[in-house]
């Protein structure tokens, strides 16, 4: 139940007043305001927007709003020396060149400073060679190529279609396969939904549209030159050769018109199966090289981008808590965009703006939250989650002692079908209870709750009558808070119907066509889905900041821990002989999970019964809840990934966007049959089981009676 000793407004009225103050029309207005010009990280335009947001948050009534700046490594194309890819003939003449920029959307022809499509942090280079088509460039795609088809990518330029996994993982895989360049393209199979027109007549990707994006493999490091520490005025910076996560080969993205011209000439091996074929009218031959008539032609990349240390600006707003000002609930989302940011990030930033305005309105009427709420407009998310990570590095001691929860607020929509939530198990019950109180915006669910429409459209695969809630992965600003610091985190947005739309993300993601009009015409004309997302995000923040007892249920962690233990055990049991040979046992892990379950159950009973009027006991119980997520942090981090420290969850080593459970054990088991030293490999599995079992047991003990 929401409550606050610092105000005479009734508890229910607080939450209702907050939610009722949120208006779709305001979100629409804010989105328009944020999307009229590009706001690329490190540019003057994005600095000006930071100052505008600072000013408006102050007007809305926050106690303080400050800019926090850092000097981080960013990447930009060379304005006078554009990036492109050529097909060259035997004389070295360029007989075809890929586009230099996207055709601008209607009404934006005269906008300056639209950054052309590029792969941020690509090194410079002009490699030329034969092409190899590598499907999505996933780990399993390279296994298929190298192990089954015996195709060697060494010294080749590979072309991979976007989708399925984070682009940085594609580049890493290509590097490991020996490629000397990577071309990324958007295939209509993944970015063109059947029956929908291309922008500007619909929400599909036109042939000239291109997805921008960074290709780093930071593994949570933040600024590549200052891993672990803030990129402040007195920072010691690594040399570029020692920078974290930079790719070593040139990379460039193209649209499907250009891809057609490269792929139509491909020769060599046929695609291994239908899963390697997209929707272009090309054979999807793997190569290497072009077919007979064109076999003397090669592909040449021309990449001239530069890496530059550049100033970025976060906006940090504070609404001081009345009772527990030293407990922080954080709502954060990024402000920087690749171009106009119609969806990513401004559909999220507009929602944050309206949430701040609503909280400010309540504060002006004399209300305060129980706990402090911090609002953040992060910079340079698109360049590797840099703004959020640098701020968290600078404030890590405060955050690890005072951080209650982090709610992320990037894109509010990636579709308009149903709700999508990824969060810590501690927040499951909060999300369930909140969505039962909110109205569904969906057609056919008038008068029904959001919980009902969400559950109907996106049912849990395990529990009937409940909605699907996914694991947190990465690729967004919650990463440092959850994966490094162990602060309970969650995110919510409206999504597409994954069953009928099998394209990756939304078609116009990171293209010039991600405009205000895209949202207003095609995704959410009434801004009702944006309003619902504002209610979910804002409602979560409200409850986390205002409820007397933190709205965390540790029993839900117990349930998933058992599920994850079962899953990793079944993976291991695919190797029964080796488990026997090397005496691999999961007994310690299952025992720890059992102990956790029992202790969590007892803790929950005590939570119902304790004297909530005793502030010391209340604080003690709340601290046990707050620090539970922290207890899953291993200070030593995961193998070769020191900034991924959560033992239960980490971004997948094969796809940064996806979450993996018991990642230490999972990675130790991955492809173990191919390891040259099985004894060493199974020894590492045993060590990871030990780390996991210890961590779960240690976390359980934080919930035991304190004395």
């Amino acid at each position: 139940k929401s409550s606050n000793e610092a105000t005479n407004i009734t508890p229910k009225h607080n939450m209702k007043a907050f939610l009722d103050e949120l208006k779709a029309e305001n979100i629409k207005k804010f989105l328009y305001n944020f999307t009229q010009i590009p706001h690329l990280a490190g540019t003057e335009q994005n600095f000006q927007l930071a100052k505008q947001i600072q000013s408006q948050w102050k007007e809305f009534g926050l106690d303080s709003v400050e800019l926090a700046h850092y000097d981080v490594l960013l990447s930009y194309p060379n304005k006078t020396h554009p990036n492109y890819i050529s097909i060259i003939n035997e004389d070295g003449n360029e007989i075809f060149n890929t586009s230099l920029f996207e055709p601008p959307p209607p009404g934006y022809e005269n906008v300056s400073d639209i950054v052309p499509p590029f792969s941020a942090f690509s090194p410079q280079g002009m490699p030329e060679g034969d092409l190899v088509y590598v499907n999505y460039a996933r780990t399993e795609d390279f296994f298929k190529l190298e192990r089954d088809m015996k195709i060697n990518c060494s010294g080749k330029i590979v072309i991979a279609r976007y989708g399925k996994v984070f682009r940085g993982n594609k580049v890493k895989n290509a590097q490991l396969a020996g490629a000397k360049g990577v071309i990324l393209y958007s295939d209509p199979a993944d970015y063109f939904a059947p029956g929908v027109k291309s922008y500007p007549d619909g929400w599909n990707l036109p042939g000239g549209g291109v997805q921008r994006g960074n290709i780093l493999n930071l593994n949570g490091a933040g600024d590549p030159l200052t891993p672990g520490y803030p990129a402040n005025e007195y920072a010691y910076r690594r040399g570029i050769a020692e920078a974290v996560g930079l790719p070593s080969i040139p990379v460039h993205p193209i649209g499907y018109y250009d891809a057609q011209k490269l792929l139509e000439k491909m020769g060599g091996s046929a695609p291994p199966d239908s899963s390697w074929r997209g929707s272009l009218k090309v054979p999807y031959n793997v190569g290497p090289g072009f077919t007979g008539n064109f076999s003397t032609q090669k592909v040449k990349m021309h990449i001239h981008s530069t890496n530059e240390v550049t100033r970025i600006y976060n906006v940090i707003g504070t609404l001081r808590g009345a009772v527990e000002p030293d407990r922080y609930v954080i709502l954060g989302g990024h402000r920087d965009s690749w171009v106009f940011g119609g969806i990513d990030p401004q559909s999220g930033a507009a929602v944050v703006h309206e949430i701040v305005r609503s909280f400010g309105t309540l504060k002006k009427e004399g209300w305060r939250p129980r706990r402090t709420i911090l609002f953040a407009s992060w910079d340079a998310e698109e360049f590797g989650l840099l703004g959020s990570t640098e701020w968290a590095e600078e404030n890590s001691r405060l955050l690890q002692e005072r951080g209650v929860a982090y709610i992320n607020a990037d894109s509010s929509i990636e579709g308009n079908y149903t709700l999508r939530v990824d969060c810590t198990p501690l927040m499951y019950s909060l999300v369930h209870n909140l969505t039962k109180e909110l109205k569904s915006p969906d057609e056919g669910f008038e008068g029904k709750s959001l919980y009902e429409s969400w559950t109907k459209k996106s049912p849990s695969p395990e529990f009937s009558g409940m909605p699907r809630i996914s694991k947190l992965g990465s690729g967004n600003d919650f990463e440092v808070f959850f994966q490094r610091l162990g602060i309970a985190s969650g995110r919510a947005r409206y999504t597409k119907n994954w069953e009928t739309n099998k394209f990756s993300g939304y078609p116009l993601y990171h293209s010039v066509y991600e405009t205000y009009e895209l949202v207003e015409k095609f995704y959410d004309p009434m801004f009702k889905y944006h309003l619902t997302v504002a209610q979910v995000r804002g409602g979560m923040v409200f409850e986390l900041a205002n409820s007397i007892v933190l709205p965390f249920d540790c029993r839900d962690y117990a349930v998933v821990l058992r599920k994850y233990a079962d899953k990793i055990y079944s993976i291991s049991m695919k190797h029964p002989q080796e488990m026997k040979t090397y005496s691999v046992s999961f007994d310690s892990l299952f025992s720890a999970v059992k102990n956790f379950t029992e202790i969590a159950s007892k803790f929950s009973e005590r939570l119902q019964d304790f004297d909530k009027s005793n502030p010391i006991v209340l604080r003690m119980m709340n601290d046990q809840l707050m620090f539970l997520e922290r207890a899953f942090i291993d200070p030593l981090g995961l193998p070769d990934r020191p900034f991924y420290r959560h033992v239960i969850y980490a971004p997948s080593s094969h796809n940064k966007y996806a979450g993996e459970s018991f990642p230490g054990i999972y990675d130790a088991l991955f492809d173990i049959e191919s390891k040259v030293d099985p004894s060493k490999a199974w020894g590492e599995v045993k060590r990871q089981i030990y780390v996991a079992a210890f961590t779960v047991q240690a976390a359980a003990e934080t919930l035991s009676e304190v004395a």
Partner: nanobody, 123 residues
Framework: EVQLVESGGGVVQPGRSLRLSCAAS????????MNWVRQAPGKGLEWVAF????????YYADSVKGRFTISRDNSKNTLYLQMNSLRAEDTAVYYC????????????????WGQGTMVTVSS
């Protein structure tokens, strides 16, 4: 109103040069590939040259390759054809034509044509 207006034609001696212009209005030139097409007296249409919307690709008919250069200035919404070493067989009405498809990388179907400008190469 969507239109293309050619200019710069005239009478020129063999071996001399001429520069044709095509001013676009009513649509954003920056989004479309553009073409020059010609029609010699009593003959059919002959495609001459193509330039992609961003200027990254230029293609020419074999008959003009090495002599003609297609270019564009998107900020001025104007297409150009620089014609050098002109020959008698270059005598024709020259039309500029807009590609139908936004962002096409090679010549496609043409949906908007100018009224043409006459070029006469004669001594």
């Amino acid at each position: 109103e969507v239109q293309l207006v050619e200019s710069g034609g005239g009478v020129v001696q063999p071996g001399r040069s001429l520069r044709l212009s095509c001013a676009a209005s009513g649509f954003p030139l920056i989004s479309y590939g553009m073409n020059w097409v010609r029609q010699a007296p009593g003959k059919g249409l002959e495609w001459v040259a193509f330039i992609s919307y961003d200027g990254s690709n230029r293609y020419y008919a074999d008959s003009v390759k090495g002599r003609f250069t297609i270019s564009r200035d998107n900020s001025k919404n104007t297409l150009y054809l620089q014609m050098n070493s002109l020959r008698a067989e270059d005598t024709a009405v020259y039309y500029c034509a807009k590609d139908r498809i936004v962002g096409a990388r090679v010549p496609d179907a043409f949906d908007i044509w100018g009224q043409g400008t006459m070029v006469t190469v004669s001594s």
